[in-house]
Interface confidence: medium
Amino acid sequence: QEFLLRVEPQNPVLSAGGSLFVNCSTDCPSSEKIALETSLSKELVASGMGWAAFNLSNVTGNSRILCSVYCNGSQITGSSNITVYGLPERVELAPLPPWQPVGQNFTLRCQVEGGSPRTSLTVVLLRWEEELSRQPAVEEPAEVTATVLASRDDHGAPFSCRTELDMQPQGLGLFVNTSAPRQLRTFVLPVTPPRLVAPRFLEVETSWPVDCTLDGLFPASEAQVYLALGDQMLNATVMNHGDTLTATATATARADQEGAREIVCNVTLGGERREARENLTVFSFLGPIVNLSEPTAHEGSTVTVSCMAGARVQVTLDGVPAAAPGQTAQLQLNATESDDGRSFFCSATLEVDGEFLHRNSSVQLRVLYGPKIDRATCPQHLKWKDKTRHVLQCQARGNPYPELRCLKEGSSREVPVGIPFFVNVTHNGTYQCQASSSRGKYTLVVVMDIEAFSSH
């Protein structure tokens, strides 16, 4: 008769470092002491007729255990295979690029250390919860890669690596380990440079708006903008509208920046940069300044009028040009009554990069002269009808402007000048029209002949 030696449990599965209770039993009636052969740490727990129980501790790797016993002088054996499973010690997704261009491939890399049995270990690369790649864990450490085409939708998406130790066939379930997620930042930066709108010329101490625009940028809110006039950084206000970025600044030129300069606009996103440059000439254009040797001159005095402007500026005073750019234009005159209120015009021209810039300035001369009454405007003999409406059209001139009064001789009767009044026979007579100012008096005699109203 053949007797058997049973080993229980048969082909068990346990977690790494665990313990196992093993029972060896035989139906042989005359068996000797049962022995357990194993490289593992073992301890006889109990034994009896035809059976022995052992405890195996700190089981770290797969092993085969063998029970043997002598039965009627011949050896019988039984065996069991222990399968040990262990979760990976480390699951790590390698860092992603700081910025990834949309439309270009990038590589996801996951490294897995430990985990057994390897035949049951799978490595999964994920975007959100979407599986991108599923591969067996091959070497130790297992290194799994997947190539991903970056899209706009990937901006801010978490990528992770998951291990699956499938012990379901052994009735133990699916053990999942997941790496810390890593977030991807994707971007689009067009190859075209920004559009830079800036003045060609900028006068010292003046301000002008500068605009820099770039379309097709993603994410526009993450872009950095640098606007500068030469080495002077401009304080830009940046606005985003969809995929368009607009930076606006005010450029103010300093005196030390005079000459050929550049306005620069840099847009940086994802570690890449797009740049636009525009040439600009900073110029200084002083004047023109028109001066009178005497702003208020006495009649008959000599007045000098001069016009000056900055270097390289050509000035022309009342049609008379200065000898050369940068020089002063001058003219002299004997002040007369007719020069009072006269304006002297100076035009200045500056050439900047082949373009001519023009400026004008003027000054008005005051000439002081005594009062006069213009005979042409003040008739000396007036024939008016009684009970009619008339205006005494007399005008005085002088600087300072004189006061004009017309008084009837022999009385203090005054007729209004320049405004309508009703004439009657009492107005008949001779009038002294006198213009007076701080510079003297001027008198003109006016006779009013009033024809009485006749009723038939």
């Epitope: 890399r109 490294q111 035949t119 591969q135 067996p136 091959v138 070497e139 450490p141 290194e143 799994v144």
Partner: antibody
């Protein structure tokens, strides 16, 4: 063109150390694994170990653990192998090679560096 | 370690002949993922080894179709349908299923 350029021959004294280098070009250095192989007259080709330039992780043939140290310098796309406590047994030609994850074969090899250990 | 045994040690051939090299492993080279990581390399005189065949039967880019690989488990073969002068050198088989990776001792293909 993918190339692995190794440093020139070395003549070293017993007990000394030597560091040989392998500069990669024509591909993304961190995308492939670098392996080192020894070829000596008596023993044919022997695999020393491998290094993943991206993670810097290494796997050694136990026979060469303590003898060889593998490192990489990502900034210059260069792999290094230092051999220490040299004896005449270490006289050989040492090759660097690369492999992709799949196929798991050494698809490109360096030209080899001859190391002679002699007093 | 997986010990790789190549036969013959030397293979004298005439140009245009067929040649066959055998490689046997001391353990199965089938990985738990189902792939078999057995590769063939050629080392021409004074040169570094170069990859011919990877994973039993896949020709590496630029390798002529007169080279073919076959086999499974522990027994593998490299065949050359028509030997040309540029094929002369030492042929090595190698496995990367198990760490450490190991190589065969080499087969020298030479002219009769």
């Amino acid at each position: 063109e993918i190339q692995l350029q190794q440093t020139g021959p070395e003549l070293v004294k017993p007990g000394a150390s030597v560091k040989i280098s392998c500069k990669a070009s024509g591909y993304s250095f961190t995308d492939c694994i670098i392996l080192w192989v020894k070829q000596s007259h008596g023993k044919g080709l022997e695999w020393i170990g491998k290094i993943n330039p991206y993670f810097g992780t290494t796997t050694y043939n136990l026979k060469f653990k303590g003898k060889a140290t593998l490192t990489v310098d990502k900034s210059s796309s260069t792999a290094h192998m230092q051999l220490n406590s040299l004896t005449s047994e270490d006289s050989a030609v040492y090759y660097c090679a690369r492999k992709e994850a799949y196929p798991d074969a050494m698809d490109y090899w360096g030209q080899g560096t001859s190391v002679t250990v002699s007093s | 370690d997986a010990v790789m045994t190549q036969t013959p040690l030397s293979l004298p051939v005439s140009l245009g002949d067929q040649a066959s090299i055998s490689c046997r492993s001391s353990q199965s080279l089938v990985h738990s993922n189902g792939d078999t990581y057995l590769h063939w390399y050629l080392q021409k005189p004074g040169q570094s080894p170069q990859l011919l065949i990877y994973k039993v039967s896949n020709r590496f880019s630029g390798v002529p179709d007169r080279f073919s690989g076959s086999g499974s488990g522990t027994d593998f073969t490299l065949k050359l349908s028509r030997v040309e002068a540029e094929d002369l050198g030492v042929y090595f088989c190698s496995q990367s299923t198990h760490v450490p990776y190991t190589f065969g001792g080499g087969t020298k293909l030479e002219i009769k």
